[in-house]
């Protein structure tokens, strides 16, 4: 089982849309795949895929999940808010026929505020 996640870095404006993609590949067929998205280590959602369908379509606040055969799991955040900023990781595990798991690399999402003054304040708040 292998998981490739993208993009590595995503910078979007508040109120727009962010799309994170996870490609899940397995050399043999699988009956049930457990998938998980985390943000800064906290679980956003943990549905499974069987018979070509996701058990859940919602993933965290304003998050929509979709599965496009053969291998693409997409997390769409719309509209994006400032607190969507963070480090996202996609994880997958074949549960049937036998357990095998893998995870992607981090996608860092940066959300720029609509108000330029908020942006100045946010930058000023970083140390150094």
């Amino acid at each position: 089982l292998s998981v490739q996640q993208g993009p590595n870095l995503l910078q979007v404006r508040q109120g727009s849309q962010a799309t994170l993609v996870c490609q899940v590949d397995q050399a043999t067929a699988w009956e049930r795949l457990r998938v998980k998205w985390t943000k800064d280590g906290a679980i956003l959602c943990q549905p499974y895929i069987t018979n070509g369908s996701l058990s859940l379509g919602v993933c965290g606040p304003q998050g929509r999940l979709s599965w496009q055969a053969p291998s693409h799991l997409t997390l769409q955040l719309d509209p994006v808010s400032l607190n969507h900023s963070g480090a996202y990781v996609c994880w997958a595990a074949v549960e049937i026929p036998e357990l095998e798991e893998a995870e992607g690399n981090i996608t860092r999402l940066f959300v720029d505020p609509d108000d330029p003054t908020q942006n100045r304040n946010r930058i000023a708040s970083f140390p150094g």
Epitope: S2, D25, A27, T28, A29, I49, G52, A69, P70, E100
Partner: antibody, heavy 120, light 113 residues
């Protein structure tokens, strides 16, 4: 590009252990998503998958051989090996190593094969 | 284990004519999760290792001549050579990767009539 080369004795006595090594060049056997297999082809041309070792060191074996087979690897030498115990004349075949990936699940690169005869 | 049954065992076709090789699996090789058939076709010439022609039942590997095509779904698959060339003389094998153990068909020997 990736190349695979089998090595080992061409003649093994019945009841002994067949040991072969596959040396991989141009690619790391630890690369995520790749599987390293042993396949044998009998004199009558039939192909049989023996088993694989994956990028993390996990193995899967053909149940028909599971009690006799071990596939291991040496990442420092970029090699993986086959051991088949208690061989008989029925194990006489050309043994090939091959690789496949999760993303494209076919044997895309093969060694040239080494003929192993089991005979006293 | 999934049993792969190829037919015919051997086939003689005239140059420029169509060659058809069949492969039947003992259970379906289609997955609704991925919309894929887990079936490959290989060509093996004398003294050489097998070479992949077709994967996922119908996807031709880059560099393989377009006279080679694969079709079928579920349990019944076909490899077609639309216009036989002299260099196509070889043994042809189907192979599934739906589950382990991976198994091959017994092969079809293709010759020129």
């Amino acid at each position: 590009q990736v190349q695979l080369q089998e090595s080992g004795p061409g003649l093994v006595k019945p009841a002994q252990t067949l040991s072969l090594t596959c040396t991989v060049s141009g690619f790391s056997i630890s690369t995520s998503g790749y599987y390293w297999s042993w396949i044998r082809q009998y004199p009558g041309k039939r192909l049989e998958w023996i088993g694989y070792i994956n990028y993390g060191g996990g193995t899967s074996y053909n149940p028909s051989l599971k009690s006799r087979v071990t596939i291991s690897r040496d990442t420092s030498k970029n090699q993986f090996s086959l051991k088949l115990t208690s061989v008989t004349a029925a194990d006489t075949a050309t043994y090939c190593c091959a690789t496949m990936a999760d993303r494209f699940a076919f044997f895309d690169v093969w060694g040239q094969g080494t003929m192993v005869t089991v005979s006293s | 284990d999934i049993v792969m049954t190829q037919s015919p065992d051997s086939l003689a076709v005239s140059l420029g004519e169509r060659a058809t090789i069949n492969c039947k699996s003992s259970q379906s090789l289609f997955s609704s999760n991925t919309n894929r058939n887990y079936l490959n076709w290989y060509q093996q010439k004398p003294g050489q290792s097998p070479k992949l022609l077709i994967y996922h039942a119908s996807t031709r590997l880059s560099g393989v001549p377009d006279r080679f095509s694969g079709s079928g779904s579920g349990t019944d698959f076909t490899l077609t050579i639309s216009s036989l060339q002299a260099e196509d003389v070889a043994d042809y094998y189907c192979q599934h990767h739906y589950e382990t153990p991976l198994t091959f068909g017994d092969g079809t020997k293709l010759e020129i009539k």
